[in-house]
């Protein structure tokens, strides 16, 4: 006949306060005859958790019908778990004896521990915007989890990042733990639509990790490129000059025209368009009056982007003699 084995398959059982815990125990043989009891702890101080034959165990129910003749499943459920239930639980086989049963074999024990889910990760980016090619730091924090073992990963647009440092506190034993990770991300010019993701995996999440995200649009500043051009066609005695402000982010932009150093207050036509990568283009048209008195006209398009120092582009207006003549003809 095969030797009796007491099988407690879970070495660790994570439970949540208030919930029901199921402690598994099966035997491989019906012999020797005698009951199976459950204990918390070992030695003379151990606590009796369940005895099918006698006693009062209001929070304990059996998974199987222990009265069935060939039952080999002695698993139990303990309801309304509290922190005081933490400990190691043993199912123990007793051999029927006279006058008393004798302890025969114990299972290896199942450690009941309190599990607590981590909070949703919160990702925070830098306080100030940074331009492409520079490195920015993102932090991710999650709190309140137990046990201490936890896995944290960083992604940028689905690609895993490797440049990060993670700390779990406290280092010693605690009821609950916190994780903080800082990732360093190099900004690309097209990162306006990019995301960084902090992913936290923990045993209490049953394979469904928690994610926190941050948009790189909050961290990036893409400075504009400026181009000022003169339109070949003119309208009457006016020449159209265009200032194209390309590929900038964020949208915050102030554009001013000046003519020979004098800021022009008058309204100008403009359009704003959004590019596929999330950056913007701004086009401003400026109409310059052409007259005999104006041989040298220098136009400046000045752009102040997102509170940064102004950048400008100049254009010396090219007015041909023919254009001047036409302009003079038009003057009464």
């Amino acid at each position: 006949e095969e030797e009796l084995q007491m099988i407690q398959p879970e070495k660790l059982l994570l439970v949540t306060v208030g919930k029901t815990a199921t402690l598994h125990c099966t035997v491989t043989s019906l012999l020797p005859v005698g009951p199976v009891l459950w204990f918390r702890g070992v030695g003379p101080g151990r606590e009796l958790i369940y005895n099918q034959k006698e006693g009062h165990f209001p929070r304990v129910t059996t998974v199987s019908d222990l009265t069935k003749r060939n039952n080999m499943d002695f698993s139990i459920r303990i309801s309304s778990i509290t922190p005081a239930d933490v400990g190691t639980y043993y199912c123990v086989k007793f051999r029927k004896g006279s006058p008393e049963n004798v302890e025969f074999k114990s299972g290896p024990g199942t450690e009941m521990a309190l599990g607590a889910k981590p909070s949703a990760p919160v990702v925070l980016g830098p306080a100030a915007r940074t331009t492409p090619e520079h490195t920015v730091s993102f932090t991710c924090e999650s709190h309140g989890f137990s046990p201490r073992d936890i896995t944290l990963k960083w992604f940028k647009n689905g690609n895993e990042l490797s440049d990060f440092q993670t700390n779990v506190d406290p280092t010693g034993q605690s009821v609950a733990y916190s994780i903080r990770s800082t990732a360093r991300v190099v900004l690309d010019p097209w990162d306006v639509r990019s995301q960084v993701i902090c992913e936290v995996a923990h045993v209490t999440l049953q394979g469904d990790p928690l994610r926190g995200t941050a948009n790189l649009s909050e961290a990036i500043r893409v400075p504009p490129t400026l181009e000022v051009t003169q339109q070949p066609m003119r309208v009457g005695n006016q020449v159209n000059v265009t200032c194209q402000v390309r590929k900038f982010y964020p949208q915050s932009l102030q554009l001013t025209w000046s003519e020979n150093g004098n800021v022009c207050q008058r309204e100008t036509a403009s359009t704003l368009t959004e590019n596929k990568d999330g950056t913007y283009n701004w086009t401003s048209w400026f109409l310059v009056n052409i007259s005999d008195q104006r041989d040298d006209v220098v136009l400046t398009c000045q752009v102040k982007h997102d509170g940064q120092l102004a950048v400008s582009k100049r254009l010396a207006l090219e007015v041909t003699v023919h254009q001047k003549d036409q302009s003079s003809d038009a003057t009464p």
Epitope: K11, V42, G43, R46, E47, G87
Partner: antibody
Framework: QVQLVESGGGVVQPGRSLRLSCVAS????????MHWVRQAPGKGLEWVAV????????DHVDSVKGRFTISRDNSKNTLYLQMNSLRAEDTAVYYC???????????WGQGTLVTVSS | DIVLTQSPDSLAVSLGERATINCKSS????????????LAWYQQKPGQPPKLLIY???IRESGVPDRFSGSGSGTDFTLTISSLQAEDVAVYYC??????????FGQGTKVEIK
């Protein structure tokens, strides 16, 4: 709520005997290991003895082995400590304590003072 | 037997200030198989029995104010009272239940108000 009430303390001469009792209520007494812990006047705590939930197993600190015996009567929800051959160094407040698993002591009685003096 | 040594023996702290009590074990009370520290803390006020404060090194007993916290692992443990109240005047004991019997206690730390 859990209550542990000790009795049986008093003044006794060296070499004599005393039996302490602890009546338990508010929990299922027969499911728990129980302990005696003592505290000499102005001193710290010293564990004295433990008995299993069913009374079949017990252990004592070396200094009282062979002189003290822990026992219980689950039908009366009562824990006992039989103290024989008492010595002056046994003078202490004796507390009965409920074990939580085989681990810590989650409830304590108010204690009973035993004074061994000639 | 495992010997627990507490420090300091006594401690005077102003009301509202932090009190820190240390407990050092002569051998580890960390069970490597379950990563649990088999250590408890008790509070004993004058003329009263001890009262369980902390078990498994860091779990607060039900009803214990959250100004009490336990930390540490292996052989070095700390009980912290984050903001001392008048009612916290007592003797505090650590206790191990890793290697039993015997259950052993530290010698106690007396906490008073400065």
């Amino acid at each position: 709520q859990v209550q542990l009430v000790e009795s049986g303390g008093g003044v006794v001469q060296p070499g004599r005997s005393l039996r302490l009792s602890c009546v338990a209520s508010g929990f299922i007494f027969s499911n728990y290991g129980m302990h005696w812990v003592r505290q000499a006047p102005g001193k710290g705590l010293e564990w004295v003895a433990v008995i299993s939930y069913d009374g079949r197993n017990e252990d004592h600190v070396d200094s009282v082995k062979g002189r003290f015996t822990i026992s219980r009567d689950n039908s009366k929800n009562t824990l006992y400590l039989q103290m024989n051959s008492l010595r002056a160094e046994d003078t202490a407040v004796y507390y009965c304590a409920k074990g939580s698993g085989s681990y810590y002591f989650d409830y304590w009685g108010q204690g009973t003072l035993v004074t061994v003096s000639s | 037997d495992i010997v627990l040594t507490q420090s300091p023996d006594s401690l005077a702290v102003s009301l509202g200030e932090r009190a820190t009590i240390n407990c050092k074990s002569s051998q580890t009370v960390l069970n490597s198989s379950n990563n649990k520290n088999y250590l408890a803390w008790y509070q004993q006020k004058p003329g009263q029995p001890p009262k369980l404060l902390i078990y498994w090194a860091s779990i607060r007993e039900s009803g214990v104010p959250d100004r009490f916290s336990g930390s540490g692992s292996g052989t070095d443990f700390t009980l912290t009272i984050s903001s001392l109240q008048a009612e916290d005047v007592a003797v505090y004991y650590c206790q191990q239940y890793y290697n039993t019997p015997p259950w052993t206690f530290g010698q106690g730390t007396k906490v008073e108000i400065k």
